[in-house]
Structure formats: structure tokens, C-alpha cells
């Protein structure tokens, strides 16, 4: 089961003490069999297993990637998993921890020594799940070394959203990923109805910006399901 497979997942954020302020931010701590936290006059405990469901790597932390934790089990459930360190196996860049990228199925360092001018590298993007590419072959793209030292501007090649400047996200464009603008109010957005469908997009949109959510456009309520337009709207 998911529980047993992922029980090593680190606790993510602690709840506030019972009787504390509602909505009080939790503090990150490391994993332990049961975490003690103050509550009133005695200590309360919280299970260290806190799965975080996701659809895109960008929903996870920078030290995580989004994937189905088991082959065949709990179909459609994707959660944030700890990134893979150097020399660990991978299927796409986001699986590798920051400072590394996926090359020939192994996480390798992306430090300066690996980037003298322009290099060619394999991007093994996973479409829909972690175990397949669109056509079973790797696509090739050119990455610039400077991408690893400055935040990417719009149109820059990226591996993850943290590579992009503020207000941009890393999204698919053909067979690579580039920095694109986070969507503003009124802009068309993609609402993923089917589990894993985001993996099939070759022109991926960013998510809606702060305070906005991707919702059906008012005047499109009567339209057929397939033609309904979603836009970024205020909460």
C-alpha cells in the first residue's frame, strides 16, 4: 500500500499546538516515528507520514518531484517524493536533486565543469507517468551553462521553475522546457480533468498567479464539456 511504501517520507509541517492560533504556520522538522509538539500542558504527537498529492513537479518542493510512488498500485495517485541524489537512477531532470540533472538514466552533477559553452544533453521527459516517454525515445535539446547561474528569463531553457525568474514558471514547449509567464487574471488556463492528462501537453501553460484559480469562464457554462474555456479568475 501507499502507506507502507512511503512511510519513510519526512514529516512536512507541524500543526499548531492544540489551543493555538488557527492557521498558524507549522515548522518543518525531520522524520521520526512520532513527533512530539506542545499542546496545552501536555505534549501531543503527529504521525510522520504526510503524503502531499501533486499533478506537476512545480507543486512539490525544490528537493522533490511528483510521481506515482508504486508501479501499478493506487493508479492515478501522484505524490511528492524526495529527489534523487547523484548517481541514482532517473527518468527525467526533475527527479534529480538541485545541482544535478538526468543524463542517460542517471543523476549527474550540473556544476560548471560540465558546462563549457553550449552542450547537448538528453531530456527524458515523462509524459503522464514516471515510466514512459511520449514515443519511447529521448528528445535532444541544447542547454546553456549560464542557465545554472542566473535565473532564466522568458524563453530560457529550464529544468524546473526554480530556474526561472520571479513571475515565470518552467513549462513544456515542444520537447524541452522553457520559462513562461505565470498566468494573469482573464488569461486562458488549463484545468486538468483527467488524471495524468497534463503529461500529454507539448505547449504547457503556467499555473494561475497569486489569488487566482483556473475556473470555467462564466459565459461558457452552456457550452459542451469539450469546448468549455477556463480562465484565471479571482477567488
Amino acid at each position: 500500500t501507499l502507506n507502507s511504501v512511503l512511510n519513510s517520507n519526512a514529516i512536512k509541517n507541524l500543526p499548531p499546538p492544540l489551543g493555538g492560533a488557527a492557521g498558524h504556520p507549522g515548522s518543518a522538522v525531520s522524520a521520526a516515528p512520532g513527533i512530539l509538539y506542545p499542546g496545552g500542558n501536555k505534549y501531543q504527537t503527529i504521525d510522520n507520514y504526510q503524503p502531499y498529492p501533486c499533478a506537476e513537479d512545480e507543486e512539490c518542493g525544490t528537493d522533490e518531484y511528483c510521481a506515482s510512488p508504486t508501479r501499478g498500485g493506487d493508479a492515478g495517485v501522484q505524490i511528492c517524493l524526495a529527489c534523487r541524489k547523484r548517481r541514482k537512477r532517473c527518468m527525467r531532470h526533475a527527479m534529480c536533486c538541485p545541482g544535478n540533472y538526468c543524463k542517460n538514466g542517471i543523476c549527474v552533477s550540473s556544476d560548471q565543469n560540465h558546462f563549457r559553452g553550449e552542450i547537448e544533453e538528453t531530456i527524458t521527459e515523462s509524459f503522464g507517468n514516471d515510466h514512459s516517454t511520449l514515443d519511447g525515445y529521448s528528445r535532444r535539446t541544447t542547454l546553456s551553462s549560464k542557465m545554472y547561474h542566473t535565473k532564466g528569463q522568458e524563453g530560457s531553457v529550464c529544468l524546473r521553475s526554480s530556474d526561472c525568474a520571479s513571475g515565470l514558471c518552467c513549462a513544456r514547449h515542444f520537447w524541452s522546457k522553457i520559462c513562461k509567464p505565470v498566468l494573469k487574471e482573464g488569461q486562458v488556463c488549463t484545468k486538468h480533468r483527467r488524471k495524468g492528462s497534463h503529461g500529454l501537453e507539448i505547449f504547457q501553460r503556467c499555473y494561475c498567479g497569486e489569488g487566482l484559480s483556473c475556473r470555467i469562464q462564466k459565459d461558457h457554462h452552456q457550452a459542451s464539456n469539450s469546448s468549455r474555456l477556463h480562465t484565471c479568475q479571482r477567488h
Epitope: G23, Y52, C54, A55, D63, S166, E210, G211
Partner: nanobody
Framework: EVQLVESGGGLVQAGGSLRLSCVVS????????MAWFRQAPGKLREIVAA????????YYTDSVKGRFTISRDDAKKTVYLQMNSLKSEDTAVYYC??????????????????WGQGTQVTVSS
């Protein structure tokens, strides 16, 4: 100030149903994953169900699969937990938790950083 307010708890007979709601108010952040946890007396607080930002990925703990349904309404900044076929072992205080992030913010590890005060659910046999 951010507030998470749960409602819908109460006393119910075994086999009955309840629908919990949690409204997020205050703050100018985007709500990513949302979850329901529960804590029975003398036990660890455990996750019950969680839903991703887009709603396309949903996690349930084994003991509630097929009985509980989590959903979210982003327009209302609300997360729901529909609980059917309740059992006495479902008796606990239920807490909602969310991941609220400022635009473009991405932590090293994603997690639930805002929590509600809890609502009591008691299932009598």
C-alpha cells in the same frame, strides 16, 4: 491573519454520514494541496485524505478508501470531506490543513503550513 475554520462535525450512528467543511480565509497566497487529518485520544494525528492543487491527484489512507471523499472548491477556498459508512474507529478530532504559498514561492519540501483548530466527530455503535 490566516484562518482555517472546520465545521460539520458531530455525533452520528455507525453506518451514518457526515460532511466536513473547512474554509480558508485571510492571507494573499495561493492554496496548493489541501488535506484532512484526524487524531483519536491517545493516538498520533494521522492523515485521512489529501487533494492536489488541481484536484487531479487524490490520496486516501487505506482505512477510509471507498467510504470517504475529499473535494475542493477553489472559488470558495474550501475543502470538504464527505464521510459515509462511518465506523466507531472513525471517532476523532478532524483537522484540515493546507499549503499556502506566495506567488512563485517554492519551499524545499512541500507541506501543510496552515492548520485549523479541529472539529469533533463521534461515531456511536
Amino acid at each position: 491573519e490566516v484562518q482555517l475554520v472546520e465545521s460539520g462535525g458531530g455525533l452520528v450512528q455507525a453506518g451514518g454520514s457526515l460532511r466536513l467543511s473547512c474554509v480558508v480565509s485571510g492571507g494573499t497566497f495561493s492554496v496548493y494541496a489541501m488535506a484532512w487529518f484526524r487524531q483519536a485520544p491517545g493516538k498520533l494525528r494521522e492523515i485521512v485524505a489529501a487533494i492536489s492543487r488541481t484536484g487531479s491527484s487524490i490520496y486516501y489512507t487505506d482505512s477510509v478508501k471507498g467510504r470517504f471523499t475529499i473535494s475542493r472548491d477553489d472559488a470558495k477556498k474550501t475543502v470538504y470531506l464527505q464521510m459515509n459508512s462511518l465506523k466507531s474507529e472513525d471517532t476523532a478530532v478532524y483537522y484540515c490543513a493546507v499549503d499556502g504559498r506566495a506567488n512563485g514561492e517554492r519551499p524545499a519540501v512541500a507541506g501543510y503550513n496552515y492548520w485549523g483548530q479541529g472539529t469533533q466527530v463521534t461515531v456511536s455503535s
